[in-house]
Each structure stands twice: as C-alpha cells, then as structure tokens.
C-alpha cells in the first residue's frame, strides 16, 4: 500500500490528520526530502558562526566560521580559534611549539621534526617552529645521479588525534574559550 504522504514534496510536510494534504513548512523550518511528516527548524548561524548558505523551506542553512576561527566537526558543528604558524591550540590559548616540533598551519598540533638519521640522511636545513627540517644527502648518496635533497617524510595529517584534541564546550564561555560548538545541534520538529 502506498504511503499517502509520499506525494508531499520537499518544502512541505504531510498532515497526519488529513491524508494527502501537504502543508508548507512554517517560517524558518524546512524539509529537504519528500514524504516528511515534520519540518525541521532551520539552523541559525549565530555568534562566531557565519551564514554560508541561507536556509530555505527545502534545505537547511549552512554555517562557516568568522575570521580567526575554523570549522571542526561534521557540517561545521564547531568553530575553533586559529593560531599562528609555529603554535598549537591548548586550553590556555595558542602556545608556541616546543623545541623539536613545528606547525606550518593555523590549526592542528605541533608535530616532531623529521628524524633525518633514521633514513641515513643528514640535516640540510634546520627546523623551526613553523617548518620541518630539510634532510640532505648522506655521504653514500653523493654518487653521481643521486638526488641531492630529499624532502622530509610526510608528516601526520594536521588535526587532532583523540588524545590530543583540545575540546572546550560552549557552556564554558570564559576567557579560555577557544572552541565553540552549536547550542542547537539537536533537531526540533514541527508538528
């Protein structure tokens, strides 16, 4: 038996009390697929969140982050403060990378310099807080035709592993607040 609500297109919801009646979504709500029995409240991009795409009756709003912050989480559910290159974000704010580590991005954590000697190389260019070392040839590599400079081994993907992630909940809006999540991530339903 065909669901009487299947005829209701996106932007409407099926009135359960009256079969086959499709009601337009009320203001600031949406249904992105047909056959829905409810419309969901539009996401509001407030505070550090910025509207990237307006809500419509057929699709939710999309948010990104204001300058100085970057998105984290599915659908930009959180905004995390940017740091400078050569820094990482901690609960107390942006801190310089410790000696022997670097970060070449505005986000993520400081990563150890490449250990050239593990590949039998020598350090050609010293590392800094912002840049990895550049490994140079070992004496054995100086034979004709050998490449003179080897790029460092690929660093781990920027971003946090679970142990390293510095998450600060939105309720804690004190001076150390560096990561802001949305208040309204759960869905509200019309009807």
């Amino acid at each position: 038996l065909q669901d009487p609500c299947s005829n209701c297109p996106a932007g409407t919801f099926c009135d359960n009390n009256r079969n086959q009646i499709c009601s337009p979504c009320p203001p600031n709500s949406f249904s992105s697929a047909g056959g829905q029995r409810t419309c969901d409240i539009c996401r509001q991009c407030k505070g550090v969140f910025r509207t990237r795409k307006e809500c419509s009756s057929t699709s939710n709003a999309e948010c990104d982050c204001t300058p100085g912050f970057h998105c984290l989480g599915a659908g930009c559910s959180m905004c995390e403060q940017d740091c400078k290159q050569g820094q990482e974000l901690t609960k107390k704010g942006c801190k310089d990378c410790c000696f022997g580590t670097f970060n070449d991005q505005k986000r993520g954590i400081c990563r150890p310099w490449t250990n050239c000697s593990l590949d039998g190389k020598s350090v050609l260019v010293n590392g800094t807080k912002e840049r990895d070392v550049v490994c140079g040839p070992s004496p054995a590599d100086l034979s004709p035709g050998a490449s003179s400079v080897t790029p460092p081994a690929p660093a781990r993907e920027p971003g946090h592993s679970p142990q390293e992630q510095k998450l600060i909940s939105e309720e804690d809006l004190g001076g150390e607040q560096k990561l802001i999540s949305e208040e309204d991530l759960h869905h509200h339903h019309h009807h």
Epitope: R18, C22, H190, H191
Partner: antibody, heavy 114, light 108 residues
Framework: QVQLVESGGDVVQPGRSLRLSCTAS????????MHWVRQAPGKGLEWVTF????????YYADSVKGRFTISRDNSKNTLYLQMNSLRAEDTAIFYC???????WGQGTLVTVSS | DIQMTQSPSSLSASVGDRVTITCRAS??????LNWYQQKPGKAPKLLIY???SLQSGVPSRFSGSGSGTDFTLTISSLQPEDFATYYC??????????FGQGTRLEIK
C-alpha cells in the same frame, strides 16, 4: 535583498481571463514554494493558492478551484497565476509570497467590473 | 478548516501604551501561529512566527505568546509607526492557510 514584484493586474469584465506574474530576486527561487494571497478592498487577507518549489504540488482555496491555475518557471524566477472566468468578487489586490510568508510583493490590483 | 478569530476588531491607543491583541483558533494548533502587521497600501509584514519567535529585524517591543487555541500579540510600548492592522495566521493545518479577520490599531 529579497524582492517580489507582481504585475499583470488590470480592469477586466466578468467572465474574462487575466494572467498575473510575480518576479523574484535576492533568494534561490527554485528552493521555495510560493503562494498567492489576495485582499479585497477594505477587507482582510484571503489565501488563494500554493505551489511547491518544483511545481509538483499545488493547492487552491475552494473559492477559486477550477478557475485559477498557479504555475512557475524556475529558469525565469517567475510565478504565475492564470485566472479564468473572473467574477466581481475576485476584485482584490493580489500578492505573491514565499512559502514561509515572510516576504511579500507590493501587490497588483485586479478589478472585475462590467 | 481551522477558523481564526481575533479580538478586538479595532483598538484605540496612545504612543507609549502597552497593547495586547488576542487570537483564538477553532481547534488546537500547538504553537503554529504567526502574526503580521499591515500598513495602508503596503504588503503584510511577518512579525512573529511559531507563536513567540521574533522575525529578524522586528523590534523587540513586539512579543507573542500562547499555545493550543489562545494566543496574544503584545506591543510593550507603542511607537507612532506601530499604528496599523494586525493579522494572526495558523500554519498548523494548511492548506487552506487561514488568517484572522484583523485588528485595526488606531491612534487615540
């Protein structure tokens, strides 16, 4: 900014036809359903018809069913109302509005008179 | 169809007054009630949606409350630009979309 502009209103004789247009700008027209709402001189608001974002679903007030047809051309950002068999009681300002009824046009006057 | 009844039909008030307009639905409409303001020769303007949510750009002196069948629109301190006609509208069981008959707010 969101703008809706109606056109096509005129003075017509009873029994004749008229087509109204509503041109939208400032928002993604193809993502919104659209309404026509009318207001007789000195009277309240009366909803007339609704069309879904893709044109697949339409609904009419009983007072216009079988006489009025709503349609849209998303490539032209335009909503239409074809009005046939017009009656004196159809005399009104006709407004188009987004499905949320949060933005309305300025209205176009239809006068049905012999 | 759900009928919407507004009271009063007209109202005289002065600048600075607190004004309340009521709207009653013929059956429960939960919180699916919107309020509009219309000035002469102009299109209606959405003020309040979902009974109590203020539409973007609307002054905070406007507020809405209620659920089920009884709703109110309150203007906390009337300004000269608030003299207009106000309509309630249910979005619970539509179509047809139904409006109240309107409340005309006039200067005393």
């Amino acid at each position: 900014q969101v703008q809706l502009v109606e056109s096509g209103g005129d003075v017509v004789q009873p029994g004749r036809s008229l087509r109204l247009s509503c041109t939208a700008s400032g928002f993604t027209f193809s993502s919104f359903g659209m309404h026509w709402v009318r207001q007789a001189p000195g009277k309240g608001l009366e909803w007339v018809t609704f069309l879904s974002y893709d044109g697949s679903y339409k609904y009419y007030a009983d007072s216009v069913k079988g006489r009025f047809t709503i349609s849209r051309d998303n490539s032209k950002n335009t909503l239409y109302l074809q009005m046939n068999s017009l009656r004196a009681e159809d005399t009104a300002i006709f407004y188009c509005a987004r499905d949320w009824l949060d933005y309305w046009g300025q209205g176009t006057l239809v006068t049905v008179s012999s | 169809d759900i009928q919407m009844t507004q009271s009063p039909s007209s109202l005289s008030a002065s600048v600075g007054d607190r004004v309340t307009i009521t709207c009653r639905a013929s059956q429960s409409i939960s919180s699916y009630l919107n309020w509009y303001q219309q000035k002469p020769g102009k299109a209606p303007k959405l003020l309040i949606y979902a009974a109590s949510s203020l539409q973007s750009g609307v002054p905070s002196r406007f507020s809405g409350s209620g659920s089920g069948t009884d709703f109110t629109l309150t203007i906390s301190s009337l300004q000269p630009e608030d003299f207009a006609t106000y309509y309630c509208q249910q979005s619970y069981s539509t179509p047809p979309i139904t409006f109240g008959q309107g409340t005309r707010l006039e200067i005393k």
